[in-house]
Interface confidence: low
Amino acid sequence: SGVFQLQLQEFINERGVLASGRPCEPGCRTFFRVCLKHFQAVVSPGPCTFGTVSTPVLGTNSFAVRDDSSGGGRNPLQLPFNFTWPGTFSLIIEAWHAPGDDLRPEALPPDALISKIAIQGSLAVGQNWLLDEQTSTLTRLRYSYRVICSDNYYGDNCSRLCKKRNDHFGHYVCQPDGNLSCLPGWTGEYCQQPICLSGCHEQNGYCSKPAECLCRPGWQGRLCNECIPHNGCRHGTCSTPWQCTCDEGWGGLFCDQDLNYCTHHSPCKNGATCSNSGQRSYTCTCRPGYTGVDCELELSECDSNPCRNGGSCKDQEDGYHCLCPPGYYGLHCEHSTLSCADSPCFNGGSCRERNQGANYACECPPNFTGSNCEKKVDRCTSNPCANGGQCLNRGPSRMCRCRPGFTGTYCELHVSDCARNPCAHGGTCHDLENGLMCTCPAGFSGRRCEVRTSIDACASSPCFNRATCYTDLSTDTFVCNCPYGFVGSRCEFPVGLPPSFPW
């Protein structure tokens, strides 16, 4: 779509005569008829295929034509077309004499024609005017013309439609060739796709307007590149949404169980070595000269029975001294001057000669030890008591004295808050670090399953991976209690299992 524009500039008819040679009376009141049509090698009569236009009376005999375009007038003349401009044309301009005010062809005298010119040729679309002048025997016409595209049409043939817009169809302006030029922040064939905030994660973020970064569920941060950990995750992180991967030394579903009591609390005294043995549980290995659960008690150096072969120990300021029985000598009475002939083996031990009778060795019966079978076996030397329990010898047997919160032969059992069956209506009891928790059967809720519920949000089995479902009465929604190894509001995400504990 475009417009052929014709600007009439000057018409000369000095003698004021018609084409027939007859003079106009009183002068030639001149108007023009213009015909624009397709290219013809010889411009012939026929329909004006590209359009026609007529002017009012512009002057008498010879006159210059005012440019009326700024005032909305008829010069330049406009010949619009709604097709692709072919690049060639034929133009016919007729000058006519109007004796009266009626300019209709049927109202004019038969010989009212003053002059007629016809041109044809090539014309490219452009802003520049082509100036031309046509002369006949009695008249001269000076004019210029051009072809320009209509609003919203572009290109060499005015065939490319482009209408700038900033709406759902697109966000663009038009280049001189009709191609789209996206407004800042938009992209795509029709400039309909917003350009998200720079760095916005391709998978985890999206945008509905430029420079925006909206996060998909499970992601957060300005660029949607930070995962959201499981709700309640205390000492843990995530690499995918709803995870809770525990920091070193922490365990449990929410990474809130202290597995590194030694590092976090340093309970062992006097340079003892601390070993973690479970949640909030540890064992201290004392340095020589110390004892107690936390190695807080100083030992007499004789408490370790350093004197052998029945030697007696005496504490001294700078250590200890062994008083050896007859037949023994050395720092710890470890050397013997006896042989099997001296019956050195006590408590039924049998004597075996060594080194041709210069020495001997005792083979001790059960429950006795020492080079002369003089010592009862101490069943506590192997530290059998767990969780900091104290080992006590009781004749032929031994027993463990447990720290508060532990029980069992070897203090290996955590004292259970669940022992008194506190959960009502068949609820399952779970020991926690700071108390207990009841998992209620369908239809019951409350801290001890004591409340009967009317709406069972768990009826649809919303929890995955054999998680326990229970109803939150305040919101009529369900909560999933995940087994170890799973997280998420429906326990749908697997995680690495935390270390197992000894209780």
């Epitope: 439609l161 029709y190 309909q192």
Partner: antibody, heavy 117, light 107 residues
Framework: EVQLVQSGGGLVQPGGSLRLSCAAS????????MHWVRQTIGKGLEWVSA???????YYPGSVKGRFTISRENAKNSLFLQMNSLRAGDTAVYYC???????????WGQGTPVTVSS | DIRLTQSPSSVSASVGDRVTITCRTS??????LAWYQQKPGKAPNLLIY???SLQSGVPSRFSGSGSGTDFTLTISSLQPEDFATYYC?????????FGQGTKVEIK
């Protein structure tokens, strides 16, 4: 009552051409964007082309260069010229109006196009 | 092109049931989504536009929700005349695209 009445469907051989028409009534046709949508057994509903109030046209890649949408506001008419037809163009074609909020409503009654040798 | 994925592809339900159909888009489209109902041999009929706006003349048992990439059509109490195929349409950007359809059948 707003109405869209379609015509011009039928059987055509592969590589052939067909022109679909849609006559609008009950509303000021020149003020609305118009669309063609087709429905195939295999691919379901598929948008084929659109023409704006200023005559601006839009096509998906599957028909670009083969289909031409046009309108004649003076006659309240919408057209779809389909050239170089393929078997995959076999469908029921609907002409659809959309207004300032860009929602497809109402739809014509549909016209079947079968491309087969 | 923006892809639309409807689920489920079909659902069997009884009169009075609550039926929910979801439509997920491959990229964010704000609220520029519509829902259509189509019965055999008929043209599609607009139910919901702009994700949640009820088209004039459509019963209030139909409702829509969602924005961005996840959208839902809900029929609160299924009526005999509601057994049909339902389509979602994104009108955010060219080319406009439809979901593959969800058929609601009588159980």
């Amino acid at each position: 009552e707003v109405q869209l009445v379609q015509s011009g469907g039928g059987l055509v051989q592969p590589g052939g051409s067909l022109r679909l028409s849609c006559a609008a009534s009950g509303f000021t046709f020149s003020m609305y964007d118009m669309h063609w949508v087709r429905q195939t057994i295999g691919k379901g509903l598929e948008w084929v082309s659109a023409i704006g109030t200023a005559g601006d046209t839009y096509y998906p890649g599957s028909v670009k260069g083969r289909f031409t949408i046009s309108r004649e506001n003076a006659k309240n008419s919408l057209f779809l010229q389909m050239n170089s037809l393929r078997a995959g163009d076999t469908a029921v074609y609907y002409c659809v109006r959309s207004g300032t909020t860009e929602w497809f409503d109402p739809w014509g009654q549909g016209t079947p196009v079968t491309v087969s040798s | 092109d923006i892809r639309l994925t409807q689920s489920p592809s079909s659902v069997s339900a009884s009169v009075g049931d609550r039926v929910t159909i979801t439509c997920r888009t491959s990229q964010g489209i704000s609220s520029w989504l519509a829902w259509y109902q189509q019965k055999p041999g008929k043209a599609p009929n607009l139910l919901i536009y702009a994700a949640s706006s009820l088209q004039s003349g459509v019963p209030s048992r139909f409702s829509g929700s969602g924005s961005g990439t996840d959208f839902t059509l809900t029929i609160s109490s299924l009526q005999p005349e509601d057994f049909a195929t339902y389509y979602c349409l994104q009108a955010n950007s060219f080319p406009y695209t439809f979901g593959q359809g969800t058929k609601v059948e009588i159980k």
